[in-house]
Interface confidence: low
């Protein structure tokens, strides 16, 4: 039908920096490039109905549903979502097309559903249907990449069995140590599955999809480097592929490399060699040891020997299940208010862990650093000197680990007081936990030096918000002290703090009566 307008429906994904419910907008915010949603005429429907392709949105993502109408004259419109009407302000772009937008900020379950846009132009009326759902990521998996030798070629293929299909990249570095950090200029990334250049110093393969990024490093023994102080150790689970690269550089080609497992040469088909000349005409040789699917009997010391270099070994340990080894006993720390301090957990784990630090039900990102001895360490320094319980939680495919820390901040007590008809209470959160004294103020003791010992009840309680301890002291009122000012004092090794309370009077003029007597 030539009277029908030309409709274009697009989805615009935004970088999140705002929060609101869905709203109709005439000028959507600046964002990513639009994705065409098709907008095809829906057959067998009463009236003219266009249907956009279904939109799947991540939780908390921000999007704009936008319709571009190429029709003469003015248009008016109305959005309907879950039987509620939302106002609609069309405007015209530079090509004189009508533009109608619906902005959904911070997508939630309640904002999923069908969005209907009714448009009235001078020529005709029509409806546009958008179906918006929250992307269900339960199906998604992100598996650590592993290596395979490419058939009939000296090349490695990187494989990650993940859903959705991940983007695989090789991360290569040719310098030593710290300069091989992700952001370093020495690092080269290649977004491809097959790698032919296998002579580099540091070779990693990473896979990323909506769930994040997982990397596997090509385990390497470099005969030109001094060996680590502790024997390098490689863990694998039964059925996983084993890859170890032995690398050596020599002034000429007159040297060879061999692999042995527990003093027995590796069988043919479990190794392959490559060599090349470097820019300074020295010869680089690499010899790969590989087992496509390891079994328990592949455990042992793998030694790479050279006719021109000292040999080096690595201990390969094959386990049935993954593990996390660390001491899970809880640890308590007390520090001064301005003292620099970090929690740290040292652990050995396979496969690599995912971890979080939690304080007061809030989670913080967790970084891990590999140590030379095969252990890893995770530190948390962002406590902002808040006392309480801190939790380190780590897990991998097969194991979970939780460790509790308590942080106490040494400080002078701060006292809060409250009184009721029958008692007075004081609270303090100083550390070390304070001791209490109660004193009565009267004409005989204007400086409040008369100590009260009867009817006092002290206790410490856990204030659940931060898991920190709060000490309290309660004074039960007796006739002898009603109508008087009393002072509660909390003291610890860092100082004393007091609060004065006027206790309820038994008669109308307590002080005058007291003075007369």
């Amino acid at each position: 039908n030539q009277d029908l307008p030309v409709i274009k429906c697009v989805l615009i994904n935004h970088k999140n920096n705002d929060s609101s419910v869905g709203k109709s907008s005439s000028y959507p915010m600046v964002s990513e490039s639009p994705e065409d949603l098709g907008c095809a005429l829906r057959p067998q429907s009463s009236g003219t109905v266009y249907e956009a392709a279904a939109v799947e949105v991540d939780v908390s993502a921000s999007i704009t549903l936008q319709v571009l109408v190429d029709a003469p004259g003015n248009i008016s419109c109305l959005w309907v979502f879950k039987h509620s009407s939302l106002n609609c302000q069309p405007h015209f772009d530079l090509q004189n097309r009508g533009v109608v937008s619906m902005v959904i900020l911070k997508m939630t379950e309640t904002q999923a559903g069908e969005y209907l846009l009714f448009i009235q132009s001078e020529a005709t009326n029509y409806t546009i249907l958008f179906t918006v759902s929250i992307r269900n990521t339960l199906l998604y998996t992100l598996r650590r990449p592993y290596f395979r030798k490419m058939e009939n070629q000296d090349a490695l293929v990187c494989i990650s069995e993940s859903v959705p299909e991940p983007i695989v990249e090789w991360v290569l570095c040719d310098s030593q140590g710290e300069s091989c950090k992700e952001e370093s200029p020495a690092v080269v990334k290649k977004e491809e599955k097959v790698l032919h250049e296998l002579f580099g110093t540091d070779i990693r393969c990473c896979a990323r999809n909506e769930l994040g990024r997982e990397c596997t490093r090509l385990f390497t023994i470099d005969l030109n480097q001094t060996p680590q102080t502790t024997l390098p150790q490689l863990f694998l689970k039964v059925g996983e592929p084993l890859w170890i690269r032995c690398k050596a550089v020599h002034v000429n080609h007159g040297f060879g490399l061999t692999w042995e497992l527990e003093n027995k040469a590796l069988e043919e088909g479990n190794y392959f060699e490559m060599s090349t000349y470097s820019t300074n005409r020295t010869m680089i040789r690499i010899l790969f040891a590989f087992v496509s699917s390891v079994a328990r009997n592949d455990t042992g010391y793998y030694t790479c020997s050279s006719s021109k270099h000292p040999s080096q070994s690595a201990l390969v340990t094959i386990v049935e299940k993954g593990f996390i080894n660390a001491t899970n006993s809880s640890e308590d720390y007390e520090i001064d208010q301005y003292e620099e301090f970090c929690f740290s957990v040292r652990f050995k784990a396979y496969p690599q862990i995912r971890c979080t630090w939690t304080f007061s039900r809030k989670s913080f990102p967790c970084e891990q650093k590999g140590l030379d001895n095969g252990y890893s360490i995770s530190k948390f320094c962002n406590h902002k000197h808040q006392p309480g319980e801190y939790i380190f939680h780590a897990e991998n495919d097969d194991a979970q680990f939780t460790k509790m820390f308590t942080l106490n901040i040494r400080r002078k007590p701060q006292v809060l007081a409250e009184a009721s008809a029958s008692q007075a209470s004081c609270f303090s959160d100083g550390y070390p936990l304070p001791s209490w004294t109660w004193k009565k103020c009267s004409d005989k003791s204007p400086n409040c030096t008369e100590e009260i010992t009867e009817g006092v009840w002290n206790r410490k309680a856990n204030r659940k918000v931060f898991g920190q301890w709060v000490s309290s002291s309660t004074l039960n009122m007796s006739e002898a002290i009603k109508g008087f000012l009393v002072k509660c004092c909390a003291y610890n090794s860092l100082g004393t703090s007091c609060e004065t309370i006027l206790l309820n009077s038994p008669g109308p003029f307590p002080f005058i009566q007291d003075n007369i007597s």
Epitope: A54, I134, L138, L139, E161, S162, S293, K321
Partner: antibody
Framework: QVQLVQSGAEVKKPGASVKVSCKAS????????MHWVRQAPGQGLEWMGI????????SYAQKFQGRVTMTRDTSTSTVYMELSSLRSEDTAVYYC?????????????WGQGTLVTVSS | DIQMTQSPSSLSASVGDRVTITCRAS??????LNWYQQKPGKAPKLLIY???SLESGVPSRFSGSGSGTDFTLTISSLQPEDFATYYC?????????FGGGTKVEIK
Amino acid sequence: QVQLVQSGAEVKKPGASVKVSCKASGYTFTKYYMHWVRQAPGQGLEWMGIINPSGGSTSYAQKFQGRVTMTRDTSTSTVYMELSSLRSEDTAVYYCARGRGYSYGYLDYWGQGTLVTVSS
Amino acid sequence: DIQMTQSPSSLSASVGDRVTITCRASQSISSSLNWYQQKPGKAPKLLIYKASSLESGVPSRFSGSGSGTDFTLTISSLQPEDFATYYCQQYYSYPPTFGGGTKVEIK
């Protein structure tokens, strides 16, 4: 109770396409993924792919990539599996199965199956 | 893809027998394994999920065990209605893959 009812048997010529439907009832259609699994005569089970009825996203087995299309119609709680460029080795019973649990990996309810015969 | 190998491919047993079927994965799949029963001309039926959890409505004579690469389905006392083909299936990584099946026949 949960039911998956599939369309009837089909006979197709090599090179043609077939579209099998699977109508779900007895549960919230958009809350569970739907798998398609096939079984050649006298053979084992072969996973073909999966569709998210909520948003329509799909994931197909490598073997069927480019030949299979899975779609859904939420208004009728029906999923469809279309297989194109049919060859004789595609003769099989095709099942839809509801996925539950981690990675939607437990196939807890199955359709009765649709026999597709490819023969010249 | 992860390969699933079932053994034996067929076995003959009598009513009341204890029957054991094994399934081996080509790599560790943790506990991500299901067992199904299929009778001729019928769709498969879920018996055990997550290696050892019994699906509701399934008789307690069926049990599953194992983790990593080796798994077992046990029928403690075979009943006449248990003569069927049994399949294991991993869902540790996509695509899900099935074992070749074990046919349990009447001796």
